[in-house]
């Protein structure tokens, strides 16, 4: 049986989580991919997704999350910049394949963000604008926020009020002028 395994990342506030999710490129290269957070007892919540169909090497930014899908390599790169303590939690990459349920990619990421900055002097760590030069673009991505109950960590949600429908739409602002609002509601 497939075991759901976790990989832990311990980072400080202001730092960047940078992970890569490996997928079968022949099957999923142009499929829409998403980055989700999993809270105990709730359905996974989609925080950001690639376009539909997913574009090769085209950065999509939602708040502090940057997704880049490298079709030639079968790799989705996920970066969460300027981490906050509240970002701590369990995350996963998924591939949307309607009408089937989303396909989860290994491993889940257990992110632990702690207070205090422990970077190298002059490493540009807090100035994410300098580090991440993303081409100016305005992207509109439709994120189908449904997911299978089998990925619920404990019990199903008590209410479906917070579970978005496949028609939910996330408007991405111009990434050169991102409003730094909290990513998590």
């Amino acid at each position: 049986a497939t075991k759901l395994t976790e990989e832990k990342y311990e980072l400080k506030e202001g730092q960047t989580l940078d992970v890569k999710c490996d997928y079968t490129l022949e099957k999923f290269a142009s499929s829409q991919k998403a980055w989700q957070i999993i809270r105990d007892g709730e359905m996974p919540k989609t925080l950001a997704c690639t376009e539909r169909p997913s574009k090769n090497s085209h950065p999509v930014q939602v708040g502090r999350i940057i997704l880049e899908d490298y079709h030639d390599h079968g790799l989705l790169r996920v970066r969460m910049v300027n981490l906050q303590v509240e970002d701590s939690g369990l995350y996963q990459c998924v591939i949307y394949q309607p009408p089937k349920e989303p396909h989860m990619l290994f491993d889940r990421i257990r992110l632990v963000v702690t207070k205090g900055f422990s970077g190298t002097p002059g490493s540009n760590e807090n100035s994410t604008q300098n580090v991440y030069k993303i081409p100016p673009t305005t992207t509109k991505a439709l994120c189908p926020l449904y997911t299978s109950p089998r990925t619920v960590t404990q019990a199903p949600p008590k209410s479906t009020a917070d579970v978005s429908t496949p028609d939910s739409e996330i408007n991405l602002t111009n990434v050169t002028d991102i409003i730094r609002v909290p990513v998590f509601n």
Partner: antibody, heavy 119, light 108 residues
Framework: EVQLLESGGGLVQPGGSLRLSCAAS????????MSWVRQAPGKGLEWVST????????YYADSVKGRFTISRDNSKNTLDLQMNSLRAEDTAVYYC????????????WGQGTLVTVSS | EIVMTQSPATLSVSPGERATLSCRAS??????LAWYQQKPGQAPRLLIY???TRATGIPDRFSGSGSGTEFTLTISSLQSEDFAVYYC??????????FGQGTKVEIK
């Protein structure tokens, strides 16, 4: 418990061929990329090749490109490295390594198999 | 290709002392760095990944720091089993993923 067991090493003449195998157990094999890393006697570690979990993507070090072929059989949980046109400088201990699920680092290693290329 | 440079090549330390090993990348790799320990006749073992995170089962006397191009592995109080060769490795995006040439930590 993750276990990686290499086999197939030995003595081969320059220009010859050898096939290394790695039997994996203790994890969902097809969910993870796998790699070969080598170490020449008394030297440091050198990455050789990586294959994605599905086998659809492969990578090679320039020093072995066109001579070595990495492959995997997810039904048998095995990783292979076909080595052709071997040179003296390919002499090394070859390690099979599991790539972590979130990034290209190596979280588990086999014990290695020695390949000696000499006439 | 990113070049990883470790220093010093050899570090002589007495048991119980602190050891500080350095690793420099030829270009910025964010936190995409791992440290490995290798003892004679054995396979390498993962110590630290993501520059800071200790791998499962690694004692807390091992700690990693740094970002961008400069990284440090610190062993706060060397035990007899810590005398070994240590390698850093970058994993910024796609292979090739290069290793440093290693630092040998020997008994003073």
């Amino acid at each position: 418990e993750v276990q990686l067991l290499e086999s197939g090493g030995g003595l081969v003449q320059p220009g010859g061929s050898l096939r290394l195998s790695c039997a994996a157990s203790g994890f969902t094999f097809n969910a993870y990329a796998m790699s070969w890393v080598r170490q020449a006697p008394g030297k440091g570690l050198e990455w050789v090749s990586t294959i994605s979990g599905s086998g659809s993507t492969t990578y090679y070090a320039d020093s072995v490109k066109g001579r070595f072929t990495i492959s995997r059989d997810n039904s048998k949980n095995t990783l292979d490295l076909q080595m052709n046109s071997l040179r003296a400088e390919d002499t090394a201990v070859y390690y099979c390594a599991k790539v972590a699920g979130s990034n290209f680092f190596f979280d588990h290693w086999g014990q290695g198999t020695l390949v000696t290329v000499s006439s | 290709e990113i070049v990883m440079t470790q220093s010093p090549a050899t570090l002589s330390v007495s048991p119980g002392e602190r050891a500080t090993l350095s690793c420099r990348a030829s270009q910025s790799i964010n936190h995409n760095l791992a440290w490995y320990q290798q003892k004679p006749g054995q396979a390498p073992r993962l110590l630290i990944y993501g520059a800071y995170t200790r791998a499962t089962g690694i004692p807390d006397r091992f700690s990693g720091s740094g970002s961008g191009t400069e990284f440090t592995l610190t062993i706060s109080s060397l035990q007899s089993e810590d005398f070994a060769v240590y390698y850093c490795q970058e994993f910024i995006l796609f292979p090739p993923h290069t290793f440093g040439q290693g630092t040998k930590v020997e008994i003073k």
